[in-house]
């Protein structure tokens, strides 16, 4: 079941998913000056069976101005499989959803794809939030949201995250004072300032996850 709405908007924050539940759709969006090829797919769809999930359809973009042929990105299915490297995953990463059954990994890029992807999520999808550059996180709970079905309607849980500019000093009761940091402003194409919080994604341990997110995981 598709979620009726997009995940909640948190001021000065972005959200991302680690993996995508079966049924998720990804729009085939092209960058400015390009369009989907005629008879091309409108979207990619995460499908699968009990043992394997993958994306159906391929997105292809062509120049809006000319009728030249598209350069199609070669699929790399081997990269949907688990990789083993010597690099350690940060212990603060969220639970590795992509290793769970019924989830697709990130679809590969395609030529002249729009920078920002538009997903249509399904019930059970989890997304994680982080403050944008120049803002720091004040956490009151997990910085995540899950699409749930209640009384026949879908809703996203509210992520417990507030992103504050470096100059602001407002705090929640009982919240530790964030460490001092240089003043900041939102990210722009010309300037970026230090984000003062490390990669913090807090997950309720009582959730359906069976393993602790704080165990170090090798890729």
């Amino acid at each position: 079941e598709l979620c009726d709405d997009d995940p909640p908007e948190i001021p000065h924050a972005t959200f991302k998913a680690m993996a995508y539940k079966e049924g998720t759709m990804l729009n085939c969006e092209c960058k400015r000056g390009f369009r989907r090829i005629k008879s091309g797919s409108l979207y990619m769809l995460c499908t699968g069976n009990s043992s394997h999930s993958s994306w159906d359809n391929q997105c292809q973009c062509t120049s809006s101005a000319t009728r030249n042929t598209t350069k199609q990105v070669t699929p790399q299915p081997e990269e949907q499989k688990e990789r083993k490297t010597t690099e350690m995953q940060s212990p603060m990463q969220p639970v590795d959803q992509a290793s769970l059954p019924g989830h697709c990994r990130e679809p590969p890029p395609w030529e002249n794809e729009a920078t920002e992807r538009i997903y249509h999520f399904v019930v059970g999808q989890m997304v994680y939030y982080q403050c944008v550059q120049g803002y720091r996180a004040l956490h009151r709970g997990p910085a995540e949201s899950v699409c749930k079905m209640t009384h026949g309607k879908t809703r996203w849980t509210q992520p417990q995250l507030i992103c504050t500019g470096e100059m602001e000093t407002s705090q929640f009761p009982g919240e530790e004072k964030p460490q001092a940091s240089p003043e900041g402003r939102p990210e722009s194409e010309t300037s970026c300032l230090v984000t003062t919080t490390d990669f913090q994604i807090q997950t309720e341990m009582a959730a359906t996850m069976e393993t602790s997110i704080f165990t170090t995981e090798y890729q």
Partner: nanobody, 125 residues
Framework: QVQLVESGGGLVQAGDSLRLSCAAS????????MGWFRQAPGKEREFVAT????????YYADSVRGRFTISKDNAKNTLFLQMSSLRPDDTGVYYC??????????????????WGQGTQVTVSS
């Protein structure tokens, strides 16, 4: 201030290996996709490899697939490019790039908002 500093380049023989590193600072490295691009003398900068924010999904240019491996260590704010079976046509300046806040991959130059100064890789025959 966002900084990307590449290292590990050098002069090697065809068939040799090199490992490039990119030390990142001034932004939340664990939240961003990253990529490697290269520019050969007299040519345009081209995509080499990219990796998602989690470090779990990767994508490569056809010319390097199977020979190069991109990885990122979110705990150490470092991006890597392991290059093996190097060929003379791999010669060029290799750049590390940070994906924009909302970009899933650092696949095209449009996806990226910050670049390192580059490190020279020269492969002799």
């Amino acid at each position: 201030q966002v900084q990307l500093v590449e290292s590990g380049g050098g002069l090697v023989q065809a068939g040799d290996s090199l490992r490039l590193s990119c030390a990142a600072s001034g932004f939340n490295f664990g939240w961003h996709a990253m990529g490697w691009f290269r520019q050969a003398p007299g040519k345009e900068r081209e995509f080499v490899a990219t990796i998602t924010w989690t470090g779990r999904d990767t994508y490569y240019a056809d010319s390097v697939r199977g020979r190069f491996t991109i990885s990122k260590d979110n705990a150490k704010n470092t991006l890597f490019l392991q290059m093996s079976s190097l060929r003379p046509d791999d010669t060029g300046v290799y750049y590390c790039a940070k994906a924009r806040e909302r970009a899933t991959w650092a696949y095209s130059e449009d996806d990226c908002d910050y670049w390192g100064q580059g490190t020279q890789v020269t492969v002799s025959s």
